[in-house]
Interface confidence: medium
């Protein structure tokens, strides 16, 4: 009996036309939602004038349906038993699952001012930037609608830059009508233990963002893992959102709609400083902001964001060192709400439920040449928003799963 089940599973999890896995892989049957909470700055003037702590108040959720589009350009390569594809991006606002509309206003850091002053530290260029910032009536903070902040707006300061640069700015600009990839993953035909594991991303086996092994593209994209998952395994996966590979470890057994699943979580060790976890040494790319690589819980992904000083963390700086959040008031980290987990059905390796949580922050530094940043006395890693991307297997799919997979085994 067990051998037959193993044989069936091995056949059905292969990523090729006609298998259960392939159908669900091309276009997920699970509804995936991305909820955003925006950090509304309550005291912009005091920060700018007195270098006070930034007081934030989170507002949300603002919910979008995401990942509803089928994978594109799916191409099987029988030579190396891989399948390549693009994952198109799309987001549809869900008013009924949101606290307000896309026209809601927020006071947030001026993204262009913070980024430009960081990218161009040259004193002469900063003098030029200062005149453009002043001329455009830009400041350290700005008021933007949710739609503008997430999906893009024309920045008045960038519109004055003396050579033709893109003047559109947004936390996720551009998003709609773009695609992530090309991903090339193993289809499992030759070895089921490699199914869904990424061979190359954008044509390469490494990212060119990090030194040494930190730069490797490891594991799957977390939507599924090779079958017959063990609790002792460390599940590696790559997330283009955070520009790195990361891993999850077993936490507990969970019953999901009658299906026994393993809950794997991202451990605090994955966010530790190299002092606490030497494996993370190559994720520390600069010495000043990281206080000589002793800070933890934030990841500088500027190399992956065209030099913009973007830092990724867990929401509310969960698992981050105290120095990171000491300049911010109003944060309440909470493991239950703010950690990331994956609920994996161990026989198939399919992720049947997940919650991916992350926070996007921007570094802003004092600059004696830029008037609106002149009075700052310290660096700030400013939280802009955090997101919770979730998906749960539907009732019908769960029923089918119970009868075809777990039912047969039990």
């Amino acid at each position: 009996g067990d051998m037959l089940i193993q044989k069936t599973i091995k056949k059905e999890v292969v990523l090729e036309e006609g298998t259960i896995a392939f159908k669900n892989w091309v276009k997920t049957g699970t509804e995936i939602y991305r909820q955003f909470w925006i950090f509304d700055v309550q005291n912009p003037q005091e920060v700018m004038m007195n270098s006070s702590n930034i007081q934030v108040k989170q507002r949300g959720p603002y919910t979008y349906r995401v990942r509803f589009l089928a994978k594109e350009n799916i191409t099987q390569d029988p030579k190396d038993n891989t399948v390549s594809f693009l994952q198109p991006n799309g987001a549809i606002f869900e008013p009924s699952l949101s606290v307000g509309t896309e026209a809601d206003n927020f006071t947030v850091l001026n993204l262009a001012v913070a980024a430009a002053s960081h990218i161009y530290p040259n004193p002469f260029v900063q003098v030029v930037l200062n005149s453009l910032i002043n001329k455009s009536k830009s400041s350290m903070f700005q008021v933007r609608t949710l739609r503008e902040l997430l999906w893009g707006y024309t920045d008045p300061f960038l519109s004055l830059v003396p050579y033709p640069v893109s003047t559109r700015v947004g936390m996720f600009y551009p998003y709609n009508n773009t695609a992530d990839g090309v991903y090339k993953v193993f289809n499992g035909k030759d070895s089921i233990s490699k199914v869904a594991i990424i061979d190359t991303y954008k044509g390469k086996r490494n990212l060119s963002y990090w030194e040494s092994y930190c730069d490797m593209i490891n594991g799957t994209d977390a939507a599924s893992f090779p079958p017959f998952v063990e609790k002792s395994q460390v599940l590696q996966f790559f997330s283009s959102d955070i520009c790195r590979s990361i891993y999850a470890v077993f936490e507990s057994d969970v019953n999901l709609k009658g299906i026994p699943v393993y809950r794997f979580v991202l451990p605090s060790k994955a966010f530790a400083s190299p002092v606490q976890n030497p494996d993370n040494h190559c994720f520390c790319t600069e010495k000043i902001i990281s206080k000589n690589c002793t800070s933890y819980g934030v990841l500088d992904i500027s190399k992956c964001k065209e030099g913009k000083p973007v830092y990724i963390s867990l929401p509310h700086f969960l698992y981050a060192s105290p120095d990171v959040s000491e300049t911010i008031d109003g944060l309440n980290p909470n493991e239950e709400e703010h950690r990331t987990y994956l609920d994996i059905e161990p026989i198939t390796g399919f992720t049947l439920q997940f919650a991916k949580r992350l926070q996007v922050n921007l570094l802003v530094k004092p600059s004696n040449k830029i008037q609106v940043l002149k009075r700052l006395k310290r660096n700030y890693i400013v939280p802009i928003l955090w997101l919770n991307e979730t998906g749960t297997i539907g009732d019908e799919k769960a029923k089918m799963f119970r009868s075809q997979v777990t039912g047969k085994i039990n």
């Epitope: 040259n122 830059v161 003396p162 030099g307």
Partner: antibody, heavy 115, light 108 residues
Framework: EEKLEESGGGLVQPGGSMKLSCVAS????????MNWVRQSPEKGLEWVAE??????????HYAESVKGRFTISRDDSKSSVYLQMNNLRAEDTGIYYC??????WGQGTTLTVSS | ENVLTQSPAIMSASPGEKVTMTCRAS???????LHWYQQKSGASPKLWIY???NLASGVPARFSGSGSGTSYSLTISSVEAEDAATYYC?????????FGSGTKLEIK
Amino acid sequence: EEKLEESGGGLVQPGGSMKLSCVASGFTFSNYWMNWVRQSPEKGLEWVAEIRLKSNNYATHYAESVKGRFTISRDDSKSSVYLQMNNLRAEDTGIYYCTPLLLRWGQGTTLTVSS
Amino acid sequence: ENVLTQSPAIMSASPGEKVTMTCRASSSLSSTYLHWYQQKSGASPKLWIYSTSNLASGVPARFSGSGSGTSYSLTISSVEAEDAATYYCQQYSGYPLTFGSGTKLEIK
């Protein structure tokens, strides 16, 4: 202080090749679009080529008169920009400057194409 | 190609005089992308005015720039001996990038 230093100029015969180099210091080279501009008494200042950033996939633009003959490239790890010039003509003679245009210019390197 | 025509080609002025030189573009361009460079004999060009009217770092306040569309100008309110140089306008609004042929300012 930002500094740009061009090298590689000299005398070359028509139809020949030459590679110019430019090393930058004093600014974050990898954040700037880089250009080559040349100057001759006959034509004055003439833009030659531009190369953008890694994030722009190192996009390049060329003046019509050098398209297909000249290639601009950069190595951010060495803070350097290069100009590979093939099939040189007498009208390519001049002082070649490398510059992020809105910053400082180098002192230039002289190329003479003559038989 | 957006051709920039500078006039006059050569001008002469006495210290204290006000001088204006012009730069005309063959097609309209955004004032954000029109710049002026100063080049003294034997030296490389230096950015002098950017985006039509903004003085580069260290440029004396007697210099000013103005214009829009196809017509731009550089003015020195009270010329000094150190202003003797050739001034070039340049556009960055489209490829190819182009320079004017220059206006040489001589001081009497």
